[in-house]
């Protein structure tokens, strides 16, 4: 009758932070000799514990090995990193000069499994306009084991990556993945989102997200027309300047009088739309009685540090005595109108 | 004083299960480092040792019964118990439930039940 | 499985009488080794543990000695309540393996 080795688990799977017992049964008190605990095979197997007098530091041995009769040198190992996975062997040896393998276990394998970190997505440095494709990337890290789901989504429509990548592709601790995803820009984009969703064993079914609000990645440029009210006096003509369905928020607008600057608009009171996109519109009364020329009026505007959109109206003098009452409209947004 | 108290039916039909349990009194079943075993005496015969339960959880078995030896323990009870499947007139016998001492040896036996498999 | 041979495997003493038991393992078994006393009707008792210790309550007219494959139980001056089957049992190897008994009698 030789003395068997028994490890019941061919595996075990463990949350890090969490302990697990690796279970080991001798068929037999006989021969006298120790019994050791090693992780992997061969010269470079370390040990793992020992049932002597040596401490190991998260190892503890489940029942009293001091007890004659005692043949269960289960271990318990505490506290479990993502480096405690591994395949662990329990080993019998024959005392003597020096002490003898004679006998090890099937060997258990520990899997330890670790959460992925929530997923961060990251977009484009500078921001993109309406049609335009950008890239977005989802990266997570940290997970055991190598098995994971990540999808896209934008606006609870699924998206297919452009790739997806697991690394490292052997064997290793824990793992990290990284994803990208090319979407098309619309004007409507300013509320939406682009979410990475990342399920794996560790999550309950309860899938980790990171959300890139589009909002961060786009610019919808404004639609800036000027247009001339019916004058309220016979000394004064109303300029309006409309920019429509812009985003984001940064804007000024600068009235000019025949391409000298008139007045600065540093808006404050932007109306917002539906669609998360801004409107502003900025009046200008210009006096009558100081113009008997033409006036060329500027509109122009600057948007997110984009070269400026400019719109101009031009307002016909005094002078002009025959086109009293009329006004033009051109298709480059100049007017004309005469004073009185 | 650690006792123990075997309980269970007298009689069993041939091919059925054979379920006994063994009650512990004076001490719980969960504490020490002990081995709790089941044992059993064909009449006017020997002892034979059917198996034990480690208290750190192995469960050791005689090979000779194993593929219809069933032992576990319900520490919530303090009580363990044996179940032994298609038993034949060849499993009429004395059994008997025992606890190991601090040092090795059986040193607390229930006073044993008398199982007879007959129709 | 470890065989365990006791003998003899019935004797009968007078009272006073010095009795010996010897119990051979069919592999060396080291000192794992426990003796049990039964009387008729009753369940087994513990008499000597690890081969030469006396258990707790035991009379000492009780003994046991022996390591390896050869072992002897000894009641140094038989008493009229030594009537019983004594047993040898092994714990080296699993399973656990009880001698054949040896019945002892009063002549």
């Known amino acids: 009758t030789e003395v068997k080795v028994i490890q019941p688990e061919k595996s075990v799977s463990v949350a890090a932070g969490d302990s697990t017992v690796l279970n080991c049964t001798l068929t037999s008190l006989l021969p006298v000799g120790p019994i050791r605990w090693y992780r992997g095979v061969g010269q470079s197997r370390q040990l793992i514990y020992s049932f002597t007098t040596e401490h190991f530091p998260r190892v503890t041995n489940v029942s009293d090995a001091t007890k004659r009769s005692n043949l269960d040198f289960s271990i318990r190992i505490s506290n479990v990193t993502p480096e405690d996975a591994g395949t662990y062997y329990c080993v019998k040896f024959q005392r003597g000069s020096p002490d003898t393998e004679i006998q090890s276990g099937g060997g258990t394998e520990v899997y330890v499994l670790a959460k992925p970190s929530p997923p961060e997505v990251s977009g484009p440095a500078d921001r993109g306009i309406p049609d335009q494709k950008v890239n977005f990337t989802c990266k997570s890290h940290g997970f055991s084991p190598r098995n994971i789901t990540l999808k896209w989504f934008k606006d609870g429509q699924e998206l297919h990556p452009l790739e997806t990548t697991v690394n490292p592709s052997g064997k290793n601790v824990s793992y990290n993945i990284s994803s990208t995803v090319r979407v098309v820009l619309n004007s409507m984009d300013v509320n939406s989102k682009v979410i990475c969703e990342v399920a794996h064993i560790t999550l309950d079914r309860s899938p980790l997200r990171g959300i890139a609000n589009l909002s961060n990645f786009i610019r919808v440029s404004p639609t800036v027309k000027v247009t001339q009210q019916s004058p309220t006096s016979m000394n004064q003509v109303n300029l309006t300047c409309r920019a429509e369905r812009f985003y984001p928020e940064d804007l000024q607008l600068i009235w000019l009088e025949n391409g000298n600057v008139s007045r600065n608009d540093t808006p404050k009171n932007l109306t917002k739309n539906t669609d998360g996109t801004y409107n502003y519109t900025s009046l200008f009364l210009v006096n009558s009685s100081a113009h008997r020329e033409d006036v060329v009026f500027t509109c122009q505007v600057k948007h997110d540090q984009q070269p400026a959109i400019t719109r101009n109206h031009t307002v016909l003098g005094f002078a002009h005595s025959s086109d009293q009452g009329s006004m033009q409209t051109f298709p480059d947004n100049n007017a004309t109108h005469n004073w009185n | 004083q650690v006792q123990l108290q075997e309980s269970g039916p007298g009689l069993v039909k041939p091919s059925q299960t054979l379920s006994l349990t063994c009650t512990v009194s004076g001490g719980s079943i969960s504490s020490g480092g002990y081995y709790w075993s089941w044992i059993r005496q064909h009449p006017g015969k020997g002892l034979e040792w059917i198996g034990a339960?480690?208290?750190?959880?192995?469960?050791y078995y005689n090979p000779s019964l194993k593929s219809r030896v069933t032992i576990s323990v319900d520490t919530s009870k303090n009580q363990f118990s044996l179940k032994l499947s298609s038993v034949t007139a060849a499993d009429t016998a004395v059994y008997y439930c025992?606890?190991?001492?601090?040092?090795?040896?059986?040193?607390?036996w229930g006073q044993g039940t008398t199982v007879t498999v007959s129709s | 499985d470890i065989q365990m041979t006791q003998s003899p495997s019935s004797l009968s003493a007078s009272v006073g009488d010095r009795v010996t038991i010897t119990c051979q393992a069919s592999q060396d078994i080291s000192n794992y080794l426990n003796w049990y006393q039964q009387k008729p009707g009753k369940a087994p008792k513990l008499l000597i543990y690890?081969?030469?210790n006396l258990a707790t309550g035991v009379p000492s007219r009780f003994s046991g000695s022996g390591s390896g494959t050869d072992f002897t139980f000894t009641i140094s001056s038989l008493q009229p309540e030594d009537i019983a089957t004594y047993y040898c049992?092994?714990?080296?190897?699993?399973?656990?393996?009880f001698g054949g008994g040896t019945k002892v009698e009063i002549k």
């Open positions: 690890d081969a030469s």
């Open positions: 025992s606890k190991e001492g601090y040092h090795s040896g059986m040193d607390v």
């Open positions: 049992q092994q714990f080296a190897y699993l399973p656990w393996t």
């Open positions: 339960i480690y208290y750190s959880g192995p469960i």
